[in-house]
Interface confidence: low
């Protein structure tokens, strides 16, 4: 349905306060580096103008399409050529080229300060003072560091950020009651701004049909009640949403965000029996409550799949006539029987089957062909179940933090030329899958774990992609992306490293070590760790350990010691000098 | 809404005939193909018979083979089964899926085969 104004539309739509909150944030996400009191000088700029469009949708520009209206208000923004530099000539494009361009620009990793939380005090005061304000800027701070962020969610966020402001403000003990919620939300801000990346690294690298089938799998799963055209209705609704988001276009995306939490609480008899609690609550919370929503049971009487995707004579018949359709049912058919696979594992077997067929439906003797095409998955269901169950065995041997030590270990050697803070960032977040899912019943580790992995290991893409420095994770990255974890899992030391040369400069440590907390002071040590095995690659497990068990006694000696900085001066060399007879 | 809604069950003399509908609504009803499935009491299901988007191709299970006919029309929205010969052994709740599927979707019409 088309309207004479998109602005307006969209504005009596969603309503003030969450269309100026939407645009906000794609502001912030455009251009990452500007003062927040600029992109708040914008908003309330278009806010006005979209004012003008819903009184009278007949009023000069009000015709123009979104990109062209936010695209032109970007542009005004006079320190664009020194700030962004070659991003400024993305002005000179026309649309809907200029979005395209805007889009290229979003960093993954923009070159912003770590968020420092104030004292509690100050921010109970800074909220208290003016609130609208304070939340604007937790927009805004998140979404220029996180350019892919589910902007409708990021809402849903923000509401809770207020809410527990308001909350533990007035209260007793006022950070008892904020910093928890604050970590809470802080921890789970960053898993959701990494599953949405992997979606939108999906639908821009991979196209939407992967995207789609990504979809039919895991809404197969979460709903295997719901017959296969409704599963493909959602597949579709859902697919345009997150390539709206994903392509900057956030009032649409929310918009039809909203719509179809709508349509599934209407339909909930067709969809699942556990949509019932997350349709009463608000707009937010209920379409957050949707995306999360536990797996319904499964129909009790589902018959065996060979019947149709094996015994059938007419498998290549069915096949030919509606390829996409006729996979489409076979994946649906079976992750609907399977929340016990991972998502990538249920895409891989389809990708299997559709192989198979396309082999066999060109041979003398299909059905002959096909036949076993169900023991060839076996293979491709123990390789991520065995890898789920050794790892799941080390972390429970080792614990968090020396099991991330060991991928630490694994990857360095797998892939050395990765920058060292890149790689301990992603082994640190491949680590934390122990404690997220290995606790989990076995029917449901693999696919925590698995699709978990996908999630981290799309970070180190999008990193790699901005500056490549391994061909090895470039293939891997670029070839399949069902096939991404199983391909980093393959890889082996990479023997046509150079090892690095040692430099006593990044082994030398000073008494500021003793004042960080708990996790800095884990990824100083794992910095170094990093170093090592680029330095000596072939270094074996039990040398490294020996290396980082001295560095630990040597760190806790200089922080008991009355002259910090005098036993770090004087003991630091000594450990440098044992750690490389140790390694030679 | 997805729905799938079966009519033109009985109760009906052996050797007898009666003509099953499917209407359905809520999905592109001329880009699927569509299945027949029965399930007699105490039994799991059973599929009868499958006809392709376009009409042009159908499919039927051995036991009903010459005895049944699937049709259906896709400006209408509606799938057809059109019962002749029919047998006590036809006794069942008789039911339309999308596609090949033989998961239940929809209530059913109860066919009875006595005399």
């Known amino acids: 349905d088309t309207h004479k104004s998109e602005v307006a539309h969209r504005f009596k739509d969603l309503g003030e306060e969450h269309f100026k909150g939407l645009v906000l944030v794609a502001f912030s996400q455009y251009l990452q580096q500007c003062p927040f009191e600029e992109h708040v000088k914008l908003v309330n700029e278009v806010t006005e103008f979209a004012k003008t469009c819903v009184a009278d949708e007949s009023a000069e520009n009000c015709d123009k399409s979104l990109h062209t209206l936010f695209g032109d208000k970007l542009c005004t923004v006079a320190t664009l050529r020194e700030t962004y530099g070659e991003m400024a000539d993305c002005c000179a494009k026309q649309e809907p080229e200029r979005n395209e361009c805007f889009l290229q620009h979003k960093d993954d990793n923009p070159n912003l300060p770590p968020l420092v939380r104030p004292e509690v005090d100050v921010m109970c005061t800074a909220f208290h003072d003016n609130e609208a304000t304070f939340l604007k800027k937790y927009l805004y701070e998140v979404a220029r560091r996180h350019p892919y962020f589910y902007a409708p969610e990021l809402l849903f966020f923000a509401a809770r950020y207020k809410a527990a402001f308001a909350e533990c403000c007035q209260a007793a003990d006022k950070a008892a009651c904020l910093l928890p919620k604050l970590d809470e939300l802080r921890d789970e801000g960053k898993a959701s701004s990494a599953k949405q990346r992997l979606k939108c690294a999906s639908l821009q690298k991979f196209g939407d049909r992967a995207f789609k089938a990504w979809a039919v799998a895991r809404l197969s799963q979460k709903f295997p009640k719901a017959e296969f055209a409704e599963v493909s209705k959602l597949v579709t609704d859902l697919t345009k949403v997150h390539t709206e988001c994903c392509h900057g276009d956030l009032l649409e995306c929310a918009d039809d965000r909203a719509d179809l939490a709508k349509y599934m609480c209407e339909n909930q008899d067709s969809i699942s029996s556990k949509l019932k609690e997350c349709c009463d609550k608000p707009l937010l919370e209920k379409s957050h409550c949707l995306a999360e929503v536990e797996n319904d049971e499964m129909p009790a009487d589902l018959p065996s799949l060979a019947a149709d995707y094996v015994e059938s004579k007419d498998v290549c018949k069915n096949y030919a006539e509606a390829k996409d359709v006729f996979l489409g049912m076979f994946l649906y058919e079976y992750a609907r029987r399977h929340p016990d696979y991972s998502v990538m594992l249920l895409l891989r077997l389809a990708k299997a089957y559709e192989a198979t067929l396309e082999k066999c439906c060109a041979a003398a003797d299909p059905h002959e062909c096909y036949a076993k095409v169900f023991d060839e998955f076996q293979p491709l269901v123990e390789e991520p179940q065995n890898l789920v169950k050794q790892n799941c065995e080390l972390f429970e041997q080792l614990g968090e933090y020396k099991f991330q030590n060991a991928l630490l270990v694994r990857y360095t050697k797998k892939v050395p030329q990765v920058s060292t803070p890149t790689l301990v960032e992603v082994s640190r977040n491949l680590g934390k899958v122990g404690a997220k899912c290995c606790k989990l019943p076995e029917a449901k580790r693999m696919p925590c774990a698995e699709d978990y992995l996908s999630v981290v290991l799309n970070r180190l893409c999008v990193l790699h992609e901005k500056t490549p420095v391994s061909e090895k994770v470039t293939k891997c990255c670029t070839e399949s992306l069902v096939n991404r974890r199983p391909c980093f899992s393959a890889l082996e030391l990479d023997e046509a490293y150079v090892p690095k040369a040692f430099n006593a400069e990044t082994f030398t440590f000073h008494a500021d070590m003793c004042t960080l907390s708990e996790k800095e002071k884990q990824v100083k040590k794992q910095t170094a760790l990093v170093e090592l095995v680029k330095h000596k690659p072939k270094a074996t497990k039990e040398q490294l350990k020996g290396v980082m068990d001295n560095f630990a006694a040597f760190v806790e000696k200089c922080c008991k010691a009355d002259d910090k900085e005098a036993c770090f001066a004087e003991e630091g060399p000594k450990f440098v000098a044992a750690s490389q007879a140790a390694l030679a | 809404q997805v729905q799938l809604v079966e009519s033109g069950g009985g109760l009906v003399q052996p050797g007898g005939s009666l003509r099953l509908s499917c209407a359905a609504s809520?999905?592109?009803?001329?880009?699927?193909?569509m299945s027949w499935v029965r399930q007699a009491p105490g039994k799991g299901p059973e599929w009868v018979s499958a006809?392709?988007?376009?009409?042009?191709?159908?499919r039927y299970a051995e036991s009903i083979k010459g005895r049944f006919t699937i049709s259906r029309d896709n400006a209408k929205k509606t799938l057809y089964l059109q019962m002749n010969s029919l047998k006590p052994e036809d006794t069942a709740v008789y039911y339309c899926?999308?596609?090949?599927?033989?998961?239940?979707g929809s209530q059913g019409t109860q066919v009875t085969v006595s005399s």
């Open positions: 899926t999308i596609g090949q599927s033989t998961s239940r």
């Open positions: 809520g999905f592109t009803f001329g880009s699927f193909g």
């Open positions: 006809i392709d988007s376009g009409g042009t191709d159908t």
